[in-house]
């Protein structure tokens, strides 16, 4: 997150981290039920660990943290390259969470976000637009949903209904490492960090997010059948 601020501890209890090896964070994720996470399809890796209830970027133990393995990764069947449509993936964890003030699921928005809606994006991704500067703790950033027209003008021929744009204030954006993390609007999960230009946080190059309102049925059906 570029030019965000430290999240309040436990203010994003649905925020998850996907880890490679012992503790190399490579993507964000979102807890949507006691045993299921959502993340971006482009975050798919064969082996990873899941960390919930953690505030710090470092692997230091925190009392609220819970660690899990992913036992099933189910990317949306329509995820495609190079267009990046349908950029979402369900992860089933090896057990259910212990519900606590640090770890709670978030409800997915059934209605699509409208232009001007204020939302919050969070993550442990790089805090510099073009270099690797990682934060000490989870970062939060208020962003505004942009019109479909403005989104398509920013990225001609690259936006479809499975995406929405948000942000666009120069110097403020999600960035590398935030992928798969939550965009929460009015207390409901509206999107996932999907993609954007490099360097991050350029004028008229907003962040692009997976438009989860388009996938409520697929998410429910997939969880029920697995």
């Amino acid at each position: 997150i570029v030019n965000g601020s430290d999240c309040q501890k436990d203010a994003q209890p649905w925020q998850g981290a996907l880890l490679l090896g012992p503790n190399k964070l490579y993507c964000g994720a979102v807890l949507i039920s006691p045993q299921w996470l959502l993340t971006a399809a482009h975050c798919r890796k064969p082996v990873f660990r899941i960390r919930l209830g953690h505030h710090s970027m470092s692997p230091v133990y925190e009392s609220g943290q819970q660690m899990f393995q992913g036992i099933k990764s189910i990317p949306h069947p329509g995820y495609s390259h190079p267009g990046h449509s349908n950029d979402l993936m369900l992860i089933k964890m090896n057990r259910k969470i212990r519900d606590s003030h640090s770890v709670k699921p978030v409800e997915i928005a059934c209605d699509c976000a409208t232009e001007g809606t204020r939302c919050m994006v969070s993550g442990w991704g790089t805090t510099s637009s073009s270099h690797n500067n990682f934060p000490k703790v989870l970062q939060c950033l208020n962003i505004t949903v942009l019109s479909e027209e403005r989104c398509k003008n920013s990225y001609p021929g690259q936006i479809d209904k499975t995406m929405f744009c948000a942000g666009d204030e120069e110097g403020r954006d999600s960035c590398q490492g935030d992928s798969g993390g939550p965009v929460v609007c009015n207390g409901k999960l509206q999107g996932l960090v999907s993609w954007g230009d490099f360097p991050c946080a350029q004028r008229n190059r907003p962040g692009v997010y997976t438009n989860l309102c388009e996938f409520v049925k697929w998410i429910k059906d997939t969880m029920n059948s697995n």
Epitope: P82, G83, H84, S130, Q176, D178, W195, G196, D197, F198
Partner: antibody
């Protein structure tokens, strides 16, 4: 300012293994943001991608060379290496190492342009 | 594999001329197309990335356009130092990363 420098033997015998190293100076090879790439150019011909490695150690190889290629990173020495086994005269080329800079973040991070190159090293395969 | 076809393979032009080189992909690559310049005995140099973005330090007489399958590199007013070979390159999620065959720009 980032600089890349290839090193290794200029002459390799047929059927042997070609080994090259690229030393990165002026920046960290363990950066999350970049790919590290090997490309070659046979005499008088165009550019051919050999393979790449990313921050997590994931490798991507040209399918036409995959069975013979290994790319690895040594973060402690800020180097990445190429090994090409069972070489023939057709592997004679100028070998370049380069940095792949992503064209975006997130799903776009897998697409990149080579923005910094080594000067190249000539490898001849001959007995 | 995605094939990249460059045309022409060579061209002769004079200083001050407007030069256009085209590159066609065998399937859509969105805007993931880069252009390089290579002079004899030297490593390639990145000119344009993401189809139309000018690499830092590259003169503004170079420009790129296109998306999907058809792309163009334009040199608005050819300078003596621009005589070189130009390559397009598609940047893949799935390997292989491929280059066009090159366009040699020679002095008329």
């Amino acid at each position: 300012q980032l600089q890349l420098q290839e090193s290794g033997p200029g002459l390799v015998k047929p059927s042997e293994t070609l080994s090259l190293t690229c030393t990165v100076s002026g920046g960290s090879i363990s950066s999350l943001d970049y790919y590290w790439v090997w490309i070659r150019q046979p005499p008088g011909k165009g550019l051919e991608w050999i393979g790449s490695i990313d921050y997590s150690g994931d490798t991507y190889y040209n399918p036409s060379l995959k069975s013979r290629v290994t790319i690895s990173v040594d973060t402690s020495k800020n180097q990445f290496s190429l090994k090409l086994s069972s070489v023939t005269a057709a592997d004679t080329a100028v070998y370049y190492c380069a940095r792949g800079r992503p064209l975006g973040y997130g799903a776009r991070h897998y697409y990149y342009a080579m923005d910094v190159w080594g000067q190249g090293t000539t490898v001849t395969v001959s007995s | 594999d995605i094939q990249m076809t460059q045309s022409p393979s060579s061209l002769s032009a004079s200083v001050g001329d407007r030069v256009t080189i085209t590159c066609r992909a065998s399937q859509s690559i969105s805007s993931y197309l880069n252009w390089y310049q290579q002079k004899p005995g030297k490593a390639p140099k990145l000119l344009i990335y993401s189809a139309s973005s000018l690499q830092s330090g590259v003169p503004s007489r170079f420009s790129g356009s296109g998306s999907g399958t058809d792309f163009t590199l334009t040199i608005s007013s050819l300078q003596p130092e621009d005589f070189a070979t130009y390559y397009c390159q598609q940047s893949p999620y799935f390997p292989p990363l491929t280059f066009g065959g090159g366009t040699k720009v020679e002095i008329k």
